[in-house]
Interface confidence: medium
Amino acid sequence: YKAEVTVSQVYSGSLRVLNRHFSQDLGRRESIAFRSESAKAQKMLQELVASTRLGTYYNSSSVYSFGEGPLTCFFWFILDIPEYQRLTLSPEVVRELLVDELLSNSSTLASYKTEYEVDPEGLVILEASVNDIVVLNSTLGCYRYSYVNPGQVLPLKGPDQQTTSCLWHLQGPEDLMIKVRLEWTRVDCRDRVAMYDAAGPLEKRLITSVYGCSRQEPVMEVLASGSVMAVVWKKGMHSYYDPFLLSVKSVAFQDCQVNLTLEGRLDTQGFLRTPYYPSYYSPSTHCSWHLTVPSLDYGLALWFDAYALRRQKYNRLCTQGQWMIQNRRLCGFRTLQPYAERIPMVASDGVTINFTSQISLTGPGVQVYYSLYNQSDPCPGEFLCSVNGLCVPACDGIKDCPNGLDERNCVCRAMFQCQEDSTCISLPRVCDRQPDCLNGSDEEQCQEGVPCGTFTFQCEDRSCVKKPNPECDGQSDCRDGSDEQHCDCGLQGLSSRIVGGTVSSEGEWPWQASLQIRGRHICGGALIADRWVITAAHCFQEDSMASPKLWTVFLGKMRQNSRWPGEVSFKVSRLFLHPYHEEDSHDYDVALLQLDHPVVYSATVRPVCLPARSHFFEPGQHCWITGWGAQREGGPVSNTLQKVDVQLVPQDLCSEAYRYQVSPRMLCAGYRKGKKDACQGDSGGPLVCREPSGRWFLAGLVSWGLGCGRPNFFGVYTRVTRVINWIQQVLTGGGGSGGGGSHHHHHHGSHHHH
């Protein structure tokens, strides 16, 4: 005799009882009415299951909650099914068996026929697991049912001192969808919140779960697929304060079926959004956008932000959204990089783009900007990177495209190409009034507009000039004079330790900032406008340093241990971290601080010049870093502002030395023998280079490196020209993310050394 192998299969669901109504007492598990009604309903459910062929497999069941409307009973039951039958008893099959029994004319005296008028249409059966029941049971001491009326904003109170885990069972009118809003109110917490697209905490119906206070998403809104949601709040540590505010609404379904006709121009023409953007998209999302283009000369570009598309095998589900574009199936995924999907136009009837959520797990709403591009020349003067659809500078010595094709087959790399014979000459020799090319082509068209390219400067009127680095050099090169605007910058005031450094004199580096918490120097920074200081994003990565309120910014400072008349201090009103900043890779290591009041410029306080995207900092050039950082690896911060000259290093050698962990947003500088370098406490401080005009331009921000001043490992800096578009966007009020390697990598911030 061999015992039959069985598996416990858990089902969760709900049914509606048409001849009963919900009362407030039934919403409280501790009430006598609840206990009595749930016992009767559980018996009814048991009888219903037992009267079908499932009866022989019945193990146990529970009715754990009641809901509004005709009385809705929420339940689970367990069947012990023979192993070989496990796959045949899907939730759909089980529902069918139960519905058939409810509709049958059998003359049973069971309560589901005599006492309860069960609505067969309203029966819901979902797959669950033993673990789901464990989670559910752990919350039953703090189980809260709430019906969310239209127009009502219902606040949800957190677990009290006695309970560590609570479950809200949320229900709204059937034709509406539940939307939960979560807003973090504290910097540090260990709480977990999970939201489910079901009445109970079913793992397979998880929409999203969050752990700890997320600075990336200080406010998040999450949509269910319909009128039911479960929210589990698990407390992480003893606290008298809720670390976030939770509230819930019932909202109407929003349509996302759109027909658009684009105009024959190349700038951004609009955006497509998932319903209730920036809310998380709903598990039931299905959007269909039809875009018509004016002619086949154009292709359609979809510009994504921190989200990208890639091909996926047909048998694999898309976990972060499925896209169907011209019969191509693509899966979305979140990424800390920009991305564009380019759709070549082959038919004049345009293109249909479908976006669908394939699973209950969702993510932040998706917003896509759309524009047209010229199919015959998609990236004028630049290189089209097929990996990410972006136009990137070509042949500038920096591999912007992940496959490096932008730096392949270059006649001249990071140099000017003579028209006569394709000879390469160094960029500073272009438009310097001395012919270097055979027929002097390097000195032609220096006073007129030229096609835009990697090293051409783009004027405000969008025309381009050939002269490299024409900004603020005292000569008007743009027709509209825009190269000489915003030039109150980069001049030393009273010009007369960093590792290997020397002491600076007062006013020598008037843009230098000291970023402090409670009187302690943490990071450097640079003044770039009358209310803005730039620094490194990694200075704020620890939870205890994330709030702008904590920081004081000192300008015009010389010594850390004393104040002098030339220095001024500011509080920080807003902090912007680059949205693509990644702690592990150090990529996009830049942040902007908005000061609480404008700076009055003086001999000791004035901004550094910001470079244009096309500004060329030549490898081999000597530039300077300044800061109060440690003067030796592991040493204390310096009292007096230190300065040191470093040499800019070509990207290819830099990348080789750091085993290809150097991104295009990074720049290297230093010395082969080490000795001169930035160190802890210098983080975010400026790497500045002097142009022939005498003005100083910001080339980099102290970011990371292997040790300090170590031989054969130079300092790595954030390459300002690669993040300048984001900087300008934030400075002009266009947003950004406003909100509150190798084994010895360190961040050059005194608080962070790993």
Partner: antibody
């Protein structure tokens, strides 16, 4: 006066070993990357090996990899080339050369000071 | 790594210009701007004339100039003089801590 003087060359049978030395004077030896370059009879220059100032970065030409070892003694201002498993095609005048501008972080991979060379003949 | 390709010989009369080419690949000359040129007189050690494609060390006459286009670098000697007669070698960094030389070009000053 900046000077590099090679020594240690001579006649050697195939398969045997030889060690070349290069004595440096007139400059701060440990500021510079150093190289060995050879020139076969009636032939062109061929780069052999290079070593960083503190010996932590080393490169070899494919033709000598696994047989030759470059090293330096900064205390004595001497560069070495240990040549094992010598072949007739290793016969050449071996030059020791210094990398330009040794204080900069990165190499220009350019040799601005050369010795007069030492002759190595591999023959049975 | 294979040697860079140079023409075996080049010639010109005094006062004329002569250009010597040096062709590599997209992994050496084409990728790095670390091209150097050396002059070697018979029985003498080489002397650097150009480094980083077009930079001249101090003491080298400005008659010598270097350039690069794609995978090919060039050395131009203008106003040719008798003492310029020598062998000329190009070299390039080739990545992975390796340097590669050209086969050499014998420059003859005619007359």
């Amino acid at each position: 006066e900046v000077q590099l003087v090679e020594s240690g060359g001579g006649l050697v049978q195939p398969g045997r070993s030889l060690r070349l030395s290069c004595a440096a004077s007139g400059f701060t030896f440990d500021d510079h990357v150093m190289y060995w370059v050879r020139q076969g009879p009636g032939k062109g220059l061929e780069w052999v090996s290079g070593i960083s100032w503190n010996s932590d970065t080393i490169g070899y030409a494919d033709a000598v990899k696994g047989r030759f070892t470059i090293s330096r003694d900064n205390a004595k201002n001497v560069l070495y080339l240990q040549m094992n498993s010598l072949r007739p095609e290793d016969t050449a005048l071996y030059y020791c050369a210094r990398e330009k501008d040794g204080d900069f972080y990165y190499n220009y991979f350019v040799m601005d000071v050369w010795g007069q060379g030492t002759t190595v003949t591999v023959s049975s | 790594q294979s040697a860079l390709t140079q023409p075996p010989s080049a010639s010109g009369s005094p006062g004329q210009s002569v250009t010597i080419s040096c062709t590599g690949t997209s992994s050496d000359v084409g990728f790095y701007n670390f091209v150097s040129w050396y002059q070697q007189h018979p029985d003498k050690a080489p002397k650097v004339m150009i480094y980083e494609v077009s930079k001249r060390p101090s003491g080298v006459p400005d008659r010598f100039s270097g350039s690069k286009s794609g995978n090919t670098a060039s050395l131009t000697v203008s106003g040719l003089q008798a003492e310029d007669e020598a062998d000329y070698y190009c070299s390039s960094y080739a990545g992975s801590n390796k340097v590669v030389f050209g086969g050499g070009t014998k420059l003859t000053v005619l007359g």
